[in-house]
Interface confidence: low
């Protein structure tokens, strides 16, 4: 019997996710694969030899190799999941625990600027715990969460790139910024 620490797994809100069982090979000796959602100690899916596969609702799908698919992730799918595998003699041969964490995907960051005081802003509207990074002509300038404001002085024309990312997604925007000598908005 093998009990491991929880495997941290990240899923994107609204997307599907597969909880794959590492180092497990399905064989004729396997009689029972049972998935539980531990917050309510409820069985959510189960494979039994010579029996119909059980699933608590249609958002769950259990594959022959023991992988659990959760469809269209919702915030309340964030939970600790446990899979227990038994052989034909009733012996618990494997147990794995998955700590499923869910994030909203980041949206494409928006770059805006004003030539009056050569100030540029990059902001991201959507996404859980976004990390913003701002680059000027390929050089990293700043890191922040939702908004970056930057005053540039090196030249009136530059190419700015802003990237937003989290554990489940990454988006970027590139804007060539050009200001006249006088500094008009």
């Amino acid at each position: 019997k093998e009990i491991t620490n929880a495997l941290e797994t990240w899923g994107a809100l609204g997307q599907d996710i597969n909880l794959d069982i590492p180092s497990f090979q399905m064989s004729d000796d396997i009689d029972d694969i049972k998935w539980e959602k531990t917050s309510d100690k409820k069985k959510i899916a189960q494979f039994r030899k010579e029996k119909e596969t059980f699933k608590e609702k249609d958002t769950y799908k259990l594959f022959k190799n023991g992988t659990l698919k959760i469809k269209h992730l919702k915030t309340d799918d964030q939970d600790i999941y446990k899979v227990s595998i038994y052989d034909t003699k009733g012996k618990n041969v494997l147990e794995k625990i998955f700590d499923l964490k869910i994030q909203e995907r980041v949206s494409k960051p928006k770059i805006s600027w004003t030539c009056i005081n050569t100030t540029l802003t990059c902001e991201v509207m959507n996404g859980t715990d976004p990390e913003l990074n701002l680059y000027q002509d390929g050089k990293h300038l700043k890191l922040s969460q939702r908004v970056i404001t930057h005053k540039w002085t090196t030249s009136l024309s530059a190419k700015f790139k802003c990237t937003a990312g989290n554990k489940v997604s990454k988006e970027s925007s590139v804007e060539p910024v050009s200001c006249p000598e006088k500094g008009l908005d």
């Epitope: 494409k108 805006s112 509207m125």
Partner: nanobody
Framework: QVQLQESGGGSVQPGGSLRLSCTVS????????VGWFRQAPGKEREFVAT??????AYADSVKGRFTISRDNAKNTVYLQMNSLKPEDTAVYYC??????????????????WGQGTQVTVSS
């Protein structure tokens, strides 16, 4: 999903006026920046004007002649075009993007686009 519908295009003589309308549906209108862009045959799409909840911006070529405004109750943005010139002839597009108040001038910064309305200025 945000949908945009332009109207008000047409033909007018130089010096004349037109008012374009852009009706936005599908999202909380007041949270969006709405811009007008135009594209003449064989040319790139260019910025005309934009409006957010807190400000407006215009291309130098239309400043003093065009006025952008919005009616949040009707989910509509208007572009009042006065003293029209032949070089204003183009297909005019409205576009929308979420904004906390910044005015965006680049087409790449807009997520949603209308189908366009033709404006022809000719004697």
């Amino acid at each position: 999903q945000v949908q945009l519908q332009e109207s008000g295009g047409g033909s007018v003589q130089p010096g004349g006026s037109l008012r374009l309308s852009c009706t936005v549906s599908g999202r909380t209108f007041s949270n969006y920046a709405v811009g007008w862009f135009r594209q003449a045959p064989g040319k790139e799409r260019e910025f005309v004007a934009t409006i957010t909840g807190s400000g407006t911006a215009y291309a130098d070529s239309v400043k003093g002649r065009f006025t952008i405004s919005r009616d949040n109750a009707k989910n509509t943005v208007y572009l009042q075009m006065n003293s029209l010139k032949p070089e204003d002839t183009a297909v005019y597009y409205c576009a929308a993007t979420w904004s906390s108040g910044y005015t965006f001038r680049s087409p790449t910064q807009y997520d949603y686009w209308g189908q366009g309305t033709q404006v022809t200025v000719s004697s």
